[in-house]
Amino acid sequence: IWELKKDVYVVELDWYPDAPGEMVVLTCDTPEEDGITWTLDQSSEVLGSGKTLTIQVKEFGDAGQYTCHKGGEVLSHSLLLLHKKEDGIWSTDILKDQKEPKNKTFLRCEAKNYSGRFTCWWLTTISTDLTFSVKSSRGSSDPQGVTCGAATLSAERVRGDNKEYEYSVECQEDSACPAAEESLPIEVMVDAVHKLKYENYTSSFFIRDIIKPDPPKNLQLKPLKNSRQVEVSWEYPDTWSTPHSYFSLTFCVQVQGKSKREKKDRVFTDKTSATVICRKNASISVRAQDRYYSSSWSEWASVPCS
Amino acid sequence: RAVPGGSSPAWTQCQQLSQKLCTLAWSAHPLVGHMDLREEGDEETTNDVPHIQCGDGCDPQGLRDNSQFCLQRIHQGLIFYEKLLGSDIFTGEPSLLPDSPVGQLHASLLGLSQLLQPEGHHWETQQIPSLSPSQPWQRLLLRFKILRSLQAFVAVAARVFAHGAATLSP
């Protein structure tokens, strides 16, 4: 058992049929010695008397807010939450597995550049009686500071019969060094409490592995005289790290016909322009990726050929 | 070349070769189904590799002030990885495929380190740790980890040379 916050305790339970559970001793926070009674949640049923109450916590019915009273006056409370371990694995019932980039991905994180700023998000189908806390650091044995802002509801989607809620949080490394080669990963820890269930989720990554640039900006076409060719030009996204001579991007230019079945022409270039053949009803798209490290490609920026 | 007098390297040549190194490092070990090698308790193996750290002067400002600190750090790393790629971690079982890019990668690491330091002038190099895994599966895991670490190292080196070629070339 350990304290999550003042008067709120997490009981770690091996969860299997007929498990013995955990013995928990609650102590009433009072100088009083006599006439103390204990109740659970809104019930008035007396569970025991005396300054301490010993309970065997086996299931969710044993968790909740225990209150000690004397003569109708509330003396103190303790809230017990359960953290389930099944077959040696902590439960992950509250958040949804996003399955990207691999199974058991509950937290996903992305960075638009090397500034040490990143965003993480998670999904749940639970709407009410749900709270989170978020912590982050660089490294775990001698952690360096990362400051996270508020975790807010960033999207609501309907998935079949279910509503899905997306929460996201922005974090910033306190002493970021964009040009350095990371040797210690960023750790992100999210704990979730739903009703009386406690769970925690972690993600560990290097910023370089979660880089996803914004799409190129100011995508423009310039027809070349007496030719079906056009010169496509674009610029680095505003959010990308500077100087661009150091933090360079590479680009993929794609000509795509109206029909998805049509063959796509693709050109890769380190420049911010390219010459391509513009087919009727086609569109030209450009996306960006770090030039020297194969992290994610940006989303496409597109313009119609006409 | 970064000769003893501390003059500039051939930035453009270094840029081309370091960019080639990036390509080779990724073709030697593409993202294998996003295999997360940090889960495999790699502290004792890849924490010993030289990293380009914040105080090494490899940022744009540091390069402008005095590129020698950074170039020395890069040189150290190149020699370190060149030795690792030539060690029994990569030469032992399981054998690399004949067309593996590791051979080219090894040669390019050597090539870039020589561009940075001609014969007759010696920068201090870092001792390579005695990593001799006994099991082929351990060797395979170690290869993956070394290549992942090398990808990060050569990315920083390539940025340094690209910036140098664009802003510091005579």
């Epitope: 709407s127 709270t131 806390s133 802002g149 508020a150 807010t152 509801l153 609501e156 809620y165 409490v193 | -």
Partner: nanobody, 125 residues
Framework: EVQLVESGGGLVQAGGSLRLSCAAS????????MGWFRQASGKKREFVAS????????SYADSVKGRFTISRDNAKNTVYLQMNSLKPEDTAVYYC?????FGSGSYYDLMYDYWGQGTQVTVSS
């Protein structure tokens, strides 16, 4: 120093309405859920309603569902409780609470970190 100040309580006849306000100062509660609890004399403090930061997710105790509405104005750092069709059993001291955690809130008062002094609501029959 964080302060939550409730207002709007008073004496009302059964079937009447009241609107409670809770003004927060000392910090913004971005991302943090807020809630209302009440305590009738001689009873335990009980959950009434909670609301997430966006105002999109609300939750109510069964005893007040359909009669009470919780809302918030983040620009004013204020949360409201509109109470309609009041009954004598709604008589209690009403407390505003804010959590330092994120999400939609909790039914348990110990999951909240900041509390107001309370405002008395008395419903006469």
């Amino acid at each position: 120093e964080v302060q939550l100040v409730e207002s709007g309580g008073g004496l009302v006849q059964a079937g009447g309405s009241l609107r409670l306000s809770c003004a927060a100062s000392g910090r913004t509660f971005e991302g943090n859920p807020m809630g209302w609890f009440r305590q009738a004399s001689g009873k335990k403090r009980e959950f009434v309603a909670s609301i997430d930061w966006s105002g999109g997710i609300t939750s109510y105790a069964d005893s007040v569902k359909g009669r009470f509405t919780i809302s918030r104005d983040n620009a004013k750092n204020t949360v409201y409780l509109q109470m309609n069709s009041l009954k004598p059993e709604d008589t209690a001291v009403y407390y505003c609470a804010a959590s330092a955690r994120f999400g939609s809130g909790s039914y348990y008062d110990l999951m909240y970190d900041y509390w107001g002094q309370g405002t008395q609501v008395t419903v006469s029959s």
